[in-house]
């Protein structure tokens, strides 16, 4: 029988290369059993992770998977940086690894490559 501990599976040292002006969904895969934990997002500022208040977030359920999503509508140049999700479960705080958004400002990009071209960089 699987453990009923809450786990957050943001991949260690993961990153996403995205463009300012595009929509983007940052996913935090959340494993839990009966009771869905309270999950929040924060953005790293040095060694401190500043909780993101008033942002559009949502849950997605898909094929026995659960994701807590932070929506960027649209991505802004200031969204560049590292993010972490954390879960409050049985009065304990579980923190994910951080994931980094590399935002390209389309104003400074002379020619905009496709997302699939970006993947090969």
């Amino acid at each position: 029988k699987e453990s009923c501990d809450v786990q957050l599976y943001i991949k260690r040292q993961s990153y996403h290369s995205i463009f300012a002006g595009d929509p983007f969904k940052l996913e935090c895969p959340v494993k839990y059993c009966a009771h869905r934990p309270q999950v929040t997002w924060c953005k790293l500022n040095g060694t401190t992770c500043v909780k993101l208040e008033g942002r559009h977030t949502s849950w997605k359920q898909e094929k026995n998977l659960s994701f807590f999503i932070l929506h960027f509508e649209p991505v802004l140049p200031s969204d560049n940086g590292s993010y972490r999700c954390s879960a409050n479960f049985l009065s304990a705080i579980i923190e994910s690894h951080s994931t980094t958004l590399y935002v390209t400002d389309v104003k400074s990009a002379s020619e905009r490559p496709s997302k699939d071209e970006m993947a090969s960089r």
């Epitope: 957050l8 260690r12 290369s17 996913e27 895969p29 998977l65 690894h97």
Partner: antibody, heavy 118, light 111 residues
Framework: EVQLQESGPSLVKPSQTLSLTCSVT????????WNWIRKFPGNKLEYMGY???????YFNPSLKSRISITRNTSKNQYYLQLNSVTTEDTATYYC????????????WGHGTTLTVSS | DIVLTQSPASLAVSLGQRATISCRAS??????????MHWYQQKAGQPPKLLIY???NLESGIPARFSGSGSRTDFTLTINPVEADDVATYYC?????????FGGGTKLEIK
């Protein structure tokens, strides 16, 4: 059901570039992580790298200067390119999907056998 | 890189008996608060097949004769009782840290 199928040449000459395709059905490559692994004749398995749902990539540092992984989301395919191959790259190449909850490989292709020889 | 050392390299077990395969990691496998150690079975001419994920969870469709245990650096795959169909090479894999790595494999034969 999720299915993966590798395709590409079975024979490549030394110094040439190897190009393989992994065609995915039953899931979208815009979710999860999509990997390349190879198995050498001596049975050793080596992890090569992945392309993620967002298009970000990771390459094993042992291959970093020679490898690229790209994708075509409209075809639901992803690709391995390995430059400057040598006889040491003779292996069976597999593509596989990583599960979100722990990154284990829950679906694999059947594999394609590559020989590097002049 | 995290080195996974599997032992024994080969194993001959009588039908109905227990087979135990060990996998030792050069570093602790626990950065997700979870042991990201997995076990695969590979038969000749086939791709590896997932048996056990996250140290002790049985993959859907895999017989309960297979079990996994362990934490931190020491992990074990147990097959009990062994059947003729279990002849294969077994690999451990860690996905705790990039690059993911595999053990060298254990070849199981019937005595």
């Amino acid at each position: 059901e999720v299915q993966l199928q590798e395709s590409g040449p079975s024979l490549v000459k030394p110094s040439q570039t190897l190009s393989l395709t992994c065609s995915v059905t039953g899931d979208s490559i815009t979710s999860a992580y999509w990997n390349w692994i190879r198995k050498f004749p001596g049975n050793k398995l080596e992890y090569m790298g992945y392309i993620s749902y967002s298009g970000s990539t990771y390459f094993n540092p042992s291959l970093k200067s020679r490898i690229s992984i790209t994708r075509n989301t409209s075809k639901n395919q992803y690709y391995l390119q390995l430059n400057s191959v040598t006889t040491e790259d003779t292996a069976t190449y597999y593509c596989a999907r990583s599960h979100y909850y722990g990154y284990y490989f829950d679906y694999w292709g059947h594999g394609t056998t590559l020989t590097v020889s002049s | 890189d995290i080195v996974l050392t599997q032992s024994p390299a080969s194993l001959a077990v009588s039908l109905g008996q227990r087979a135990t395969i060990s996998c030792r990691a050069s570093e602790t496998i626990d950065s997700y608060g979870d042991s990201l150690m997995h076990w695969y079975q590979q038969k000749a001419g086939q791709p590896p097949k997932l048996l056990i994920y996250r140290a002790s969870n049985l993959e859907s469709g895999i017989p309960a004769r297979f079990s996994g245990s362990g934490s931190r650096t020491d992990f074990t795959l147990t097959i009990n009782p062994v059947e003729a169909d279990d002849v294969a090479t077994y690999y451990c894999q860690q996905t705790d840290e990039d690059p993911y790595t595999f053990g060298g494999g254990t070849k199981l034969e019937i005595k």
